[in-house]
Amino acid sequence: YDFTNCDFEKIKAAYLSTISKDLITYMSGTKSTEFNNTVSCSNRPHCLTEIQSLTFNPTAGCASLAKEMFAMKTKAALAIWCPGYSETQINATQAMKKARKSKVTTNKCLEQVSQLQGLWRRFNRPLLKQQ
């Protein structure tokens, strides 16, 4: 999916008002310095591409993020503010959701959500030069 036509400011507002809090809740009990940020993004469409991938694509050691509250809210925000997103992405992620077992918070998942927090922070500051 090409995130170029999304309403970035509305997505940012949804992140600040609700998604960010759910990410913090998920990470509660984890030190902010525990994980290094290894995933980066260069602009807002690129950030959303990486956020989409890390949130909904199963990875080795962490296959359950799509059921988390922050993931459902991310999906809703993208469905609302990115025209055409639902048709191209939702059915695929729903199929994956059905295949998943119960929620398990592994260290790998915590690391992945830490990466997500970094991507969202970068999304919110699009004018900053890439480090």
Epitope: K10, K73, A79, I80, E87
Partner: antibody, heavy 120, light 111 residues
Framework: QVQLVQSGAEVKKPGSSVKVSCKAS????????INWVRQAPGQGLEWLGV????????IYAEKFQGRVTITADTSTSTAYMELSSLRSEDTAVYYC?????????????WGQGTLVTVSS | QSALTQPPSASGSPGQSVTISCTGT?????????VSWYQQHPGKAPKLMIY???KRPSGVPDRFSGSKSGNTASLTVSGLQAEDEADYYC???????????FGGGTKLTVL
């Protein structure tokens, strides 16, 4: 069962406000969109706006911006639509309608409708 | 945002097919594959018959089909039955600030 149940008919004076409720049951309220659509006597359908409780997002039709307020109480699975500065042209049946999960613009479940009559 | 344009009436005999058109612009029907159709019997709430241009919700007979070409969407009812007599409304998404604009409605009469 899966349903939307709306509050009863209202008669209002011009210039006043009306608040219509829509109670959901049988499905996960927060995940869907709750849209409001009205139909004046003998006329077609007109979309007023939507709320997606999961993310607390409300979107209003440009025509009703500033005059309509849509809210939701997730603890009671109830959505509300308040229309202010009523005029006779606002006389209509007001429907709440469920927008499909992540496809909030397709209305797959409707309330029974609430007749709002604006008359002096 | 202007309403979509539908013919006010359409008719057909039992067993026949009838097609109802719905014309919009590149800002709505032409710009998105997010067209839906609703059936409304007198005094009742509307019912979703077609969504995403041509998909049918479960429980809707396959006699109902939808299509789109350019800025015009169409609903076809084949093998007309008496219970198909109703008003039909098309709807289209028209951007992130307009989830639905409706057509004026078409009264379908089964002769």
């Amino acid at each position: 069962q899966v349903q939307l149940v709306q509050s009863g008919a209202e008669v209002k004076k011009p210039g006043s406000s009306v608040k219509v409720s829509c109670k959901a049951s049988g499905f996960t309220f927060g995940s869907y969109g709750i849209n409001w659509v009205r139909q004046a006597p003998g006329q077609g359908l007109e979309w007023l706006g939507v709320i997606v409780p999961l993310v607390g997002v409300t979107i209003y039709a440009e025509k009703f911006q500033g005059r309509v307020t849509i809210t939701a109480d997730t603890s009671t699975s109830t959505a509300y639509m308040e229309l202010s500065s009523l005029r006779s042209e606002d006389t209509a049946v007001y429907y709440c309608a469920r927008g499909q999960e992540y496809f909030y613009w397709y209305f797959d479940l409707w309330g029974q409708g609430t007749l709002v009559t604006v008359s002096s | 945002q202007s309403a979509l344009t539908q013919p006010p009436s359409a008719s057909g005999s039992p067993g026949q097919s009838v097609t109802i058109s719905c014309t919009g612009t590149t800002s709505d029907i032409g710009g998105y594959n997010r067209v839906s159709w609703y059936q409304q019997h007198p005094g009742k709430a509307p019912k979703l018959m077609i969504y995403e241009v041509s998909k049918r919700p479960s429980g809707v007979p396959d006699r109902f089909s939808g299509s789109k070409s350019g800025n015009t969407a169409s609903l076809t009812v084949s093998g007309l039955q008496a219970e198909d007599e109703a008003d039909y409304y098309c709807s289209s998404y028209a951007g992130t600030d307009t989830f639905a604009i409706f057509g004026g409605g078409t009264k379908l009469t089964v002769l």
